[in-house]
């Protein structure tokens, strides 16, 4: 099928992100019309050489045409228009410049084909991003659920067959001692020789018989813990590491982790089976004591039928032993896996085979580093002790589910402390932030005279004594828990594996859609794309290095891309979360696309966008306007930082955005967001009803207070440059009466003269460039 | 649940000899031999356990019928002598996982669960 037909069937979540693909520099329309013709071109290779650019772009003008006689045979007026329309537009930007439209398109079609990639892994994982906890049963699901049936069926199966055989041994074992007993074997005397022969013969019957039993159930053991081998196998090596791993993705923000019911009931199930099994296998030895002979299948098998169910056993048992939620402190519920050392943490661990008989039972333990000693490369590493409540006993009635587990909720980190500051020793090779310490719970079982000792450990933490770490912790916490499954490779960091651009695209777009309602559309991804790679048209399968992401500075900037991108999350979730969640902040675009959406828009159209400039995280809108000759002006004020949004909400800045002309008239030139929204229509409903900003006048005072205003103001002049970001000014008191003071200006009236030359223009609202 | 699957019926002339086979799933303590003749009740003829491999019959057959197990095969025959047209019923195989199945069982007094076949037709012509 077609990728834009593929595309067509997308839910509405992706649609939104397609819409946001095209604009006028490459008409959807367009797309819609040559869709066949369009995909079949090598876009990326017209995009890298000029000439055929050239040749491509004539086709496709070539096309155009073709498709506009379909129309005009179909006497469509509409299509007809748009077309001509559209030829007319590509002819006079690409004309000159063909591999400019050859990018655009190829960069579209590849966008397109991640957006389909992500759809297809959503599908796959069962709509999981929707429903967490669904029910969701795939087909291997469903053959694990038979191979486990077919398991206790065989083991049901094989327990009738044990008290037929036990049947069978103590109708033998009652023959063989009655004629026994008579003296009938040794007499074979006169009329009753026939008879004992007769009743020797049937004795000997019976135990081919009663041989042919016990070969058979041997067999069939054999063959049943060959099955549970397969169904455990499955069990641990694919479901609970699927489970694990997709524990990894929720820890750094990916869809939520499906809950482990279905697992432990499986895994009890199995664990069921395997005890019942067991205790079969216990019951052939006490046969076996009970009547024996020459090539007894039992004597022969058992031992190693033992040995195979009780490995078995153990190995299942000690693979149920799992952290249900990882180390994560409290007060930075979105940022698992980091701990400060003074500040609690919790953790949950779980067993998932439910015997009841084990409630209150299992003591567990808590220790961090159990290992260490062992790792080369944590020499140099500091050292921890857990403090706190770090011993609990399992039990079912803590958790709502039933399920047995133990939550630790009262954990705290200690350095200890060593003569050089805390290192154990100088040759650290190794950044704190990038030192990784797994958190150990043990335990030991003691279970139909079985001892089983159970040990399971958190994903690696970082561990930080400053809050102001927090930022580099977590982003050895994304690219840990992105690039390996592997659960305690604490050495990571000494040769961090490179990520690619897919990966780290995905991981970015999750650290706003697991603490905010929007993650990061495909076109947000390629401007961040753009940051870390340069410019470029598929990124797909770039690499990414670990120093890259978070430790080198941008170019021409002094901070990294992690950190920069750091401060926008912490921006968007403290100060413009609601403005984020409707979509109304494009956030991420190159100063080039900005320039081609914005250009073709009626003044006073505008965007929001994030500063690429500021370190601690800055928003800043960016407008359209004409200048005196008429010409399209596209212009950005300062960013605001988080420092002036602490003492106005950007929508309120929005709304009273205003630039000061030259002849000292207030003019606001925020009209429409980006495409087309009202200001008010987009904005209003975060602005507080001028009514409340003053309930109250003060009792005592004969006349009512005036009110005041708070609104940003930009003081321009004609030699204003293009581009050039524009300094905000507050203007400190504009007072009102009734509604005339947003258009205060000299003219209005004597006393608004006055007031406009004694206005106090205070300190910058933001002080960093763009 | 124990299968039983009778085979070895026929039309036989009165005074001749017929041997009923009867294969179970799996190995009970006892099995035996019942038939019920059209608008009659069904009444045992032949068991035998596996303790002390001693047959028990119904007074009418005595040293007439005999029966036997071969417990490799989990199977038990009737060996029908001297066949009399009173005899002609549908033989069904039973079987109960107990080992006691003297009169009681034949009687049909004996508690416990008892499996059936579907029963192989005898008929005797004089």
């Known amino acids: 099928m077609a990728q834009w037909n593929q595309l067509q069937q997308l839910d509405t979540r992706y649609l939104e992100q397609l819409h946001q693909l095209y604009s006028d520099s490459f008409p959807m329309e367009l797309r819609q019309f040559l869709a066949p013709w369009i995909e079949s071109q090598d876009w990326a290779y017209a995009a890298s050489k000029e000439s055929h650019a050239t040749l491509v772009f004539h086709n496709l003008l070539g096309e155009i045409d073709q498709q506009y006689s379909r129309f005009l045979q179909e006497s469509n007026v509409l299509y007809q228009h748009n077309l001509r329309r559209i030829k007319q537009f590509l002819q006079s930007r690409y004309l000159e410049k063909p591999m400019e439209i050859a990018r655009i398109v190829a960069r579209c079609l590849w966008e397109e084909s991640r957006l389909l990639q992500t759809a297809a892994t959503a599908a796959q994982q069962g709509g999981q991003a929707n429903h967490p906890t669904a029910a969701v049963v795939t087909e291997k699901q469903q053959m694990l659920e038979q191979h486990l049936q077919d398991v206790r069926k065989r083991v049901q199966d094989l327990e009738q067959k044990m008290k037929v055989v036990e049947n069978l041994q103590d109708d033998f074992d009652f023959n063989y001692k009655t004629l026994k007993s008579q003296g009938d074997m040794q007499d074979l005397n006169g009329n009753n020789q026939s008879v004992t022969r007769q009743k020797m013969q049937q004795l000997e019957q019976m135990l081919t018989a009663l041989d042919q039993m016990r070969r058979s159930i041997v067999s069939e053991l054999a063959g049943l813990l060959s099955a549970m081998e397969y169904v455990q196998k499955t069990l641990t090596d694919e479901e609970l590491a699927d489970w694990k791993r997709r524990q990894q993705i929720a820890c750094i923000g990916g869809p939520p982790n499906i809950c482990l019911d279905r697992l432990e009931n499986w895994i009890t199930s199995l664990a069921e089976s395997q005890l019942q099994t067991r205790q079969q296998i216990k019951k052939l030895e006490e046969l076996q004591q009970k009547v024996s002979y020459k090539g007894d299948p039992i004597v022969q098998h058992r031992p190693m039928l033992e040995e195979r169910i009780v490995e078995l056993f153990r190995n299942l048992m000690k693979s149920a032993f799992v952290v249900e939620r990882q180390p994560c402190m409290p007060m930075h519920p979105d940022r698992p896996l980091v701990i400060k050392t003074g500040v609690q943490f919790t953790t949950k661990v779980r067993l998932l085979v439910k015997f009841p008989e084990l409630n209150y039972q299992l003591k567990i333990k808590v220790c961090i580093d159990k290992d260490s000693g062992d790792v080369a490369a944590l020499r140099g590493s500091r050292k921890f002790n857990i403090l706190g409540t770090n011993t609990k006993v399992m039990n079912m009635e803590e958790s709502n589910n039933g399920s047995l587990s133990a939550e630790f909720k009262h954990l705290t980190l200690r350095e200890q402390r060593c003569g050089n500051g805390g290192r154990a020793n100088c040759d650290a090779s190794l950044i704190v932030t990038e030192e990784l310490h797994l958190i150990t719970f043990e335990t030991e079982v003691y279970h139909q005279g079985l001892k089983i000792d159970l040990e399971t450990h958190s994903l690696p933490v970082v561990v930080i004594s400053n809050i102001c770490q927090m930022p580099n912790a977590w982003a050895s916490i994304l690219w840990y828990n992105m690039l390996t499954n592997n659960p305690k490779n604490v050495n990571f960091f000494t040769k961090p594996p490179i990520g690619t651009w897919d990966q780290v695209a995905e991981v970015l777009s999750w650290q706003f859609s697991s603490t905010t309602k929007r993650g990061l559309s495909i076109e947000q991804l390629t401007t961040l794309a753009e940051k870390l790679l340069g410019p470029g048209v598929n990124y797909s399968g770039c690499q990414i290095t670990w120093a890259k992401f978070c430790k080198e500075n941008m170019a021409g900037k002094g901070f990294s891309f992690w950190v920069w991108l750091d401060n926008i999350i912490d921006l968007v979730k403290k100060y413009i979360l609601a403005l984020w969640n409707e979509g109304y902040i494009m956030g991420f675009i190159s100063k080039e696309r900005e320039r081609a959406i914005l250009s073709t828009k009626p003044p006073g159209t505008f965007l929001l966008r994030f500063s690429e400039s500021s370190k601690e995280g800055g928003v800043t809108f960016t407008w359209v306007e004409k200048d005196i000759s008429g010409k399209t002006q596209i212009q950005s004020v300062e960013p605001y930082t988080k420092q002036q949004l602490n003492n106005m909400s950007f929508a309120e800045i929005i709304m009273g955005y205003k630039i000061m002309d030259a002849t000292n008239i207030l003019v606001s030139p925020l009209v429409y967001l980006y495409p087309d929204i009202p200001k008010e229509e987009a904005f209003g409903k975060y602005c507080r009803p001028e009514s409340q900003e003053h309930p109250e006048a003060d009792p005592g005072s004969a006349a009512p207070y005036l009110k005041t205003k708070f609104i940003c103001v930009t003081p321009t002049t004609c030699s204003n440059t293009i581009d050039l970001p524009m300094s905000p000014r507050t203007l400190d008191s504009l007072m009102q009466f009734g509604n005339n003071g947003e258009g205060a200006e000299p003219s209005a009236g004597g006393q608004f003269e006055s007031l406009t030359f004694d206005m106090e223009l205070t300190s910058e609202c933001a002080t960093s460039p763009m | 649940d124990v299968q039983l699957v009778e085979s070895g019926g026929g039309s036989v002339q009165a005074g001749d000899s017929l041997r009923l086979s009867c294969v179970a799933s799996t190995y009970t303590g006892c099995m035996g031999w019942f038939r019920q003749a059209p608008g009659k009740e069904r009444e045992g003829v032949a068991a035998l356990s596996s303790r002390g491999f001693a047959g028990h019959y119904t007074d009418s057959v005595k040293g007439r019928f005999s029966i036997s197990r071969d417990y490799v095969k989990n199977a038990v025959y009737l060996q029908m002598n001297t066949v009399k047209p009173e005899d002609a019923a549908m033989y069904y195989c039973?079987?109960?996982?107990?080992?006691?199945?003297?009169?009681?069982?034949?009687?049909?007094?004996?508690?416990?669960?008892?499996?059936w076949g579907q029963g192989t037709l005898v008929t005797v012509s004089s």
């Open positions: 039973a079987a109960r996982e107990g080992w006691e199945c003297g009169e009681t069982w034949l009687d049909r007094t004996a508690g416990g669960h008892t499996y």
